[in-house]
Each structure stands twice: as C-alpha cells, then as structure tokens.
Interface confidence: medium
C-alpha cells in the first residue's frame, strides 16, 4: 500500500531551512481529560506556528515510551503497550481498556528540523466505572465539556437578548433549534470521532520527493523489518501543521 511510507511536509508543506532558528511553534493539546475505567480515550496534540519539518512524534507516559510515529517508518507501538494502545487518529493515540493506574501525565514530543523538540503535556484521570456502565466507551474530555458549557451559555445569552428585543416567539424557537442542531454537531467531534478538529491529519497534497516515491513491493520488505524490530505497519503518519 502506498501509505507504507509517506511523503511528509510540515507547515504549509514548505521545506525547513537547514540553519537552526528560533523555536516559534506551539503545541496545543486536549489538556486535562478524564475517562472511565475500562473505557477508551484519545490523546491529541497539534503543532502550529512553525515552518519546521516534523520528523517524528513520540508519545510517553512518565518515563515510558508508548508509541512513535516516524515520518519514514510509520508507527511503532511499544511491545508492552501493544494490546492497549492503538495509533491515531492522525498523530494522536488511543488508549483502551483503561485502568486507574493509567492516571497520570502523558507527553507528546514533536521532533522537528531545524527547531528541535516541542513537548505537549496531557493529564489523564481515570475514574471508577459509574453504576451500571461497563465496557469500553469513549469519554468526552474536559475540553468537550467546556465547549458544551459555552454552547449552553451562548444559547442562554442569545435567548435573553432575543427576549429583551421582543423578537417573535417563532424566531426564538428557530434560534434555539438551530443551536441545538449545532450542539449535536459538536458532540459528533467527541474523542470517539475518527478525526476530531485539530487532528494533524489534514487532506493536503504532499509533494513527491521528500521521502521518496514508494512502490508496492517495498511494503513487504518494510513489513519484514517492522517484524524484526516490533514495528507495526498501522497506517499513515501524516505530519501536517497549520500556520498559526
């Protein structure tokens, strides 16, 4: 498959200069998140505001390597986590079958050239399962809850403004209905969605020549190599950062 080795550019697909410069990039993360024991969660980071070329993204928990997404070689999941960690969406990481021991700090480390490394921090709290809920289900992170709260506040403000301006009742219902629809749309971008906003997988054309055009037969050779060093050909490492 052609995505065994991807052609990857960062920052508007511009080649980074060889000379090292100021580190201007910023990492946006999902911040502090909570999830239920036995459930799943997506850890997401996003690098923006830099012209540096992203070469590798590492995911760590405290001092342990969880996974690596490498521009040339794709995903590597640490053998001790391979049963509970899945790559993606994008450069994110999905943690499954959560236990209370998974509570703690997680780091995404973006290796870039020529900037160096950018590190993002996420704090995950795994909560005991609620009353009769079992099995893996995705939790809405605190960011999602905050967004929902904002939507509710906005709704209230708009309703109050609408009422004070003595708009027609019909119009008020229309606005509320509209907002309800928008709110439902936002919930679709919860961590269970395949590619939430801020995901690093953007549909962008990558110029040929960065890592070399790959032919189908290369995949078999790569697969062998992955087996030797416990790499898993798990899908694309699509590195892309937005100019911000």
């Amino acid at each position: 498959m052609r995505w065994c080795l991807l052609l990857i550019w960062a920052q508007g697909l511009r080649q980074a200069p060889l000379a090292s410069g100021m580190m201007t990039g910023t990492i946006e993360t999902t911040g502090n998140i909570s999830a239920e024991k036995g459930g799943s969660i997506i850890l997401q980071c996003h690098l923006s505001s830099t012209t540096a070329q992203v070469t590798q993204v590492n995911w760590e928990q405290q001092d342990q390597l969880l996974a690596i997404c490498n521009a040339d070689l794709g995903w590597h999941i640490s053998p001790s986590f391979k049963d509970r960690v899945a790559p993606g969406p994008g450069l994110g990481l999905t943690l499954q079958s959560l236990t209370v021991n998974d509570t703690g700090e997680y780091f995404c480390i973006y290796h870039t050239y020529p900037d160096g490394t950018y590190t993002g921090r996420i704090f995950l709290e795994v909560l005991e399962s609620s009353v009769a809920e079992h099995g893996a289900r995705f939790q809405i992170p605190l960011l999602g809850a905050m967004a929902a709260t904002l939507v509710v506040i906005c709704t209230a403000v708009i309703v109050v403004v609408a009422l004070t301006r003595k708009k027609k009742a019909l119009r008020i219902h229309s606005v509320e209905g509209d907002l309800r629809r928008k709110s439902a749309g936002q919930e679709e971008w919860s961590p269970s969605a395949p590619s939430p906003p801020g995901s690093c997988v953007q549909a962008e054309a990558a110029p040929a020549g960065l890592c070399g055009e790959q032919r189908g037969e290369d995949c078999a050779e790569l697969h062998d190599y992955f087996n030797v060093l416990s790499y898993r050909s798990l899908g694309n490492c699509s590195f892309f950062t937005e100019t911000g």
Partner: antibody, heavy 119, light 110 residues
Framework: DVQLVESGGGVVRPGESLRLSCAAS????????MSWVRQAPGEGLEWVSL????????YYADSVKGRFTISRDNSKNTLYLQMNSLSAEDTAIYYC????????????WGLGTLVTVSS | QSVLTQPPSASGTPGQRVTISCSGI????????VSWYQQLPGTAPKLLIY???QRPSGVPDRFSGSKSGTSASLAISGLQSEDEADYYC???????????FGGGTKLTVL
C-alpha cells in the same frame, strides 16, 4: 538481507581529503536515516555524522564540523562522507550504520573501512 | 564532545548475572532513549537493545535493558563465554543535536 558495504578508506597525509562511500542493499534506502560512526584503534565508538532519509537534514559531531560533509544519493542507494583537512586524530575504522531516525537506534552496521592519516 | 559514562570493564563467571551501567543520558522528555551495542573482537557493532529495554529478534532474552532518570543499565544473565565483548550504550542528545556513545565496557567471562 540488509547489507552495508563501506569503501574509499586508505592512507592519506595530514591536510589531505578522502571520500568514503557506503553501498546499501536489501532495504528501501530512502526511508532510513544513515550515520557514520568511527572507531580509533583500541578506542571506543564515536558518532561522526547523520543524514535523514530524504537528505534534507544533516548533523555532525563537533570534532568534524566544517571539515566533513555527509551526503546521499538515493537513486544509487549510496551514502557518502567527504572528509577534508584530515589529521592524525581522524585515523579510525569508519562504519556506516542504518538508523530509524535521530533518537532511535542503529540497527544495521557495515564492516567498516580503515582510514589512516599519517605523514 | 561529551560521552555517556560506562565502567571500562566488567567480569563474571559462566552462569552469573552481570550488569553494565551507563550514566549521563539526557533528562529531557523524548530524548532519553538508550540503545546498547555488542562488539565482538574484530567485528562491527551489533544492536542488542533499543528504546531502553526492547530486544530485536535474534537477541537472546538473557540480555535486558532498563532505564531510570539519567542512567541506564544492561543486564546479562546466565553469562556465557561467547558474551565476552565490548558493550556500548548510546543516546541522542537534543541539546547538542548529536549522538553520544558511552566509552564502552569490556566484559570478560572468567
């Protein structure tokens, strides 16, 4: 099978230049970072230089900066090390090593080529 | 160029467990992966351990790696005569933009 074969070593005088080559086979060359690592007689390993798979990024040890240049020709599956202003301290076996990327590891090594700088 | 610190020599008798230390690894998150290499006399180095504690296929499980903070160690259990070799640790240093190798440890099987 992955194979790395170095060539170009030999005896040179101080101040002279030499170009080492490393012919790679058995893997997709353009997908791997490559490094040169040297070992002076009876001494330990010393990393010399690294180049990314696409040839965009290159890194050097302080001891060789400004004198050595690493390059690669992905169409020929060959890695190069251009060594200028050689001194006796550069005398060593030079190994070509395949990497995954900067902070990973060297998974395959060549047998090495000996460079002797002597007057 | 600074190097990682290893004891110059280590020894053990067949069947014993030997540990080789490596200190001076970058404490910066994301740059602290250690790999270990075995160099038998007159041969090229061979990858033994990668990403601190992972073994490539073909490397016996007698070899194990661990890392804590800025130090790492290589343990060899059930020592065998063919383990007599030089052992090197290596790690990338992001502040130097350079690979660092330990000075090497010569393991002697008595």
């Amino acid at each position: 099978d992955v194979q790395l074969v170095e060539s170009g070593g030999g005896v040179v005088r101080p101040g002279e230049s030499l170009r080492l080559s490393c012919a790679a086979s058995g893997f997709t060359f353009s997908s791997h970072a490559m490094s040169w690592v040297r070992q002076a007689p009876g001494e330990g390993l010393e990393w010399v230089s690294l180049i990314s798979g696409n040839g965009v990024s290159a890194y050097y040890a302080d001891s060789v900066k400004g004198r050595f240049t690493i390059s690669r020709d992905n169409s020929k599956n060959t890695l190069y090390l251009q060594m200028n202003s050689l001194s006796a301290e550069d005398t060593a076996i030079y190994y070509c090593a395949r990497g995954t990327y900067l902070i990973s590891f060297f998974d395959y090594w060549g047998l090495g080529t000996l460079v002797t700088v002597s007057s | 160029q600074s190097v990682l610190t290893q004891p110059p020599s280590a020894s053990g008798t067949p069947g014993q467990r030997v540990t080789i230390s490596c200190s001076g690894i970058s404490a910066k998150i994301g740059n602290n992966y250690v790999s270990w290499y075995q160099q038998l006399p007159g041969t090229a180095p061979k990858l033994l351990i990668y990403f601190n504690n992972q073994r490539p296929s073909g490397v016996p499980d007698r070899f194990s790696g661990s890392k804590s903070g800025t130090s790492a160690s290589l343990a060899i259990s059930g020592l065998q005569s063919e383990d007599e070799a030089d052992y090197y640790c290596a790690s990338w240093d992001d502040s130097l933009n350079a690979w660092l190798f330990g000075g090497g440890t010569k393991l002697t099987v008595l």
